[in-house]
Amino acid sequence: GPVPPSTALRELIEELVNITQNQKAPLCNGSMVWSINLTAGMYCAALESLINVSGCSAIEKTQRMLSGFCPHKVSAGQFSSLHVRDTKIEVAQFVKDLLLHLKKLFREGRFN
């Protein structure tokens, strides 16, 4: 059945924690992605950034989980206004930034 938003957010946080803790080699071979503004609509924006990373099995689960928060289908090369188009960061840093923000949302009870 449907997963409550609080559960989905907790599972996403757990997966991001797992990625950061189990990171041995550079995540996704050091691939760079567009930074995003961590505001409303950030789930789709995050997926829009990560979807452009190719051949990185470590983030497949994260991408799937993010799709559960995004009502529209995301395509490679698609960019929302939430992207900071002049700033690219490594996937590892992107994941850490996203994780910190999601933990804050979870603590505040903001699950959508």
Epitope: G1, P2, V3, P5, A8, I51, S54, G55, C56, S57, A58, I59, E60, K61, Q63, R64, M65, S67, G68, F69, C70, P71, K73
Partner: nanobody
Framework: VGQLVESGGGSVQPGGSLRLSCAAP????????IAWFRQSPGKEREWVSC????????IYSDSVKGRFTISRDNTKNMVYLQMNSLNPEDTAVYYC??????????????????????WGQGTQVTVSS
């Protein structure tokens, strides 16, 4: 004509097993996540399972969890659905699908409406005594 080709369907008694296969003659299946769906007469098409490109992420619907196993062999360009402990409610036409993405779509939440663009013609599975 379907972009994907399913095989392995058939008739089986309750409690029996079948292994479905999904192939893609026209593109490299190993580059993409693959999902299985099923549709029984008079019902909507139901999502069953999905496996990511690497095989590291596998998910199942509650109705098949613990009985079905999805796997892939990228060297053979194949994806499989092993179905055990089959019951009459599993009777349906089974389809594999992809959207040429590396990751599975979330079956719940807001992403449940995401569609797959490439489908097979389906293979019939009948479970009856």
């Amino acid at each position: 004509v379907g972009q994907l080709v399913e095989s392995g369907g058939g008739s089986v008694q309750p409690g029996g097993s079948l292994r479905l296969s999904c192939a893609a003659p026209r593109f490299t299946l190993g580059s993409y996540a693959i999902a299985w769906f099923r549709q029984s007469p008079g019902k909507e098409r139901e999502w069953v399972s999905c496996i990511s490109r690497s095989g590291g992420d596998t998910i199942y619907s509650d109705s098949v969890k613990g009985r079905f196993t999805i796997s892939r062999d990228n060297t053979k360009n194949m994806v499989y659905l092993q179905m055990n402990s089959l019951n009459p409610e599993d009777t349906a036409v089974y389809y594999c699908a992809t959207d040429k993405r590396s990751f599975c779509y979330a079956p719940n939440g807001l992403g449940k409406g995401w569609t797959y663009d490439y489908w097979g013609q389906g293979t019939q599975v009948t479970v009856s005594s």
